[in-house]
């Protein structure tokens, strides 16, 4: 079990434990921050982030940011709270298991965001329509 | 009854080296994931690294990667911490720890076995 020197002495946001008193480990996510990108005007994309990291708190998730302005195309992988908004955006899709990129208004650039909660999921960037479940035919499927 | 036994902390100068090692027993070592985590005082738990059961995926928070590295025996029951290139910011109180259940994939992971710890210090 967990020593009890450990559960008295630590900071809530650090240590997530269930009722029988067992720990949560943090989120295993693509943590490259910010690079350079040749994915556009495809379905998916992979990453190219070759750094795995455990994330720093057990409540964060991966996020990936795709941004494509008159000069270049970048890929940002992390990990962030979803309590707290990225780039002044909601992580409204964190519990999802793949990163589904939804784009979201900004001025002077094209840019879509996503956020997920399984291991290195924003390795994988989808921005097919088919795997967003706004698409009427897919809820169709998902509840017959 | 699962123990976890660590050792190999100390004092060290910084820009020194350690190796943590962490016996395990009672229960099936090799189909479990590991991990270390560290304490520093006054402050809260920080998962280190993390190793597969088989031990051929490992994982490390960003404020070690690069300098440590976990391994494992699986025909010793044991598991590795190599610490390298150690500052300051390193002296805590170093803990192995076993995953809860032994299935893979997407599911949350949670650790429910710890040993008592060993500690490093790293000072001139």
């Known amino acids: 079990t967990i020593p009890p020197h450990v559960q008295k002495s630590v900071n809530n946001d650090m240590i997530v434990t269930d009722n029988n008193g067992a720990v949560k480990f943090p989120q295993l996510c693509k943590f490259c921050d910010v690079r350079f990108s040749t994915c556009d005007n495809q379905k998916s994309c992979m990453s190219n982030c070759s750094i795995t990291s455990i994330c720093e708190k057990p409540q964060e998730v991966c996020v990936a940011v795709w941004r494509k302005n008159d000069e270049n195309i970048t890929l940002e992988t992390v990990c962030h709270d979803p309590k707290l908004p990225y780039h002044d955006f909601i992580l409204e899709d964190a519990a999802s298991p793949k990163c589904i990129m939804k784009e979201k208004k900004k001025p002077g650039e094209t840019f879509f965001m996503c956020s997920c909660s399984s291991d290195e999921c924003n390795d994988n960037i989808i921005f097919s329509e088919e795997y967003n479940t706004s698409n009427p035919d897919l809820l169709l499927v998902i509840f017959q | 009854e699962v123990q976890l036994l660590e050792s190999g902390g100390g004092l060290v100068q910084p820009g020194g080296s350690l190796r943590l090692s962490c016996a395990a027993s009672?229960?099936?070592?090799?189909?479990?994931?590991m991990a270390w985590a560290r304490q520093a005082p006054g402050k809260g738990l920080e998962w280190v690294s993390l190793?597969?059961?088989?031990?051929?995926?490992?994982y490390y928070a960003n404020s070690v990667k690069g300098r440590f590295t976990i391994s494992r025996d699986n025909s010793k029951n044991t598991l590795y911490l190599q610490m390298n290139s150690l500052r300051a910011e390193d002296t805590a109180v170093y803990y192995c720890?076993?995953?809860?259940?032994?299935?893979?994939?997407?599911?949350?992971?949670?650790?429910?076995?710890w040993g008592q710890g060993t500690l490093v210090t790293v000072s001139s």
């Open positions: 190793i597969s059961a088989e031990g051929t995926r490992t």
């Open positions: 009672g229960f099936t070592f090799f189909n479990y994931e």
């Open positions: 720890a076993k995953r809860r259940d032994a299935s893979m994939g997407h599911t949350t992971r949670r650790f429910d076995h």
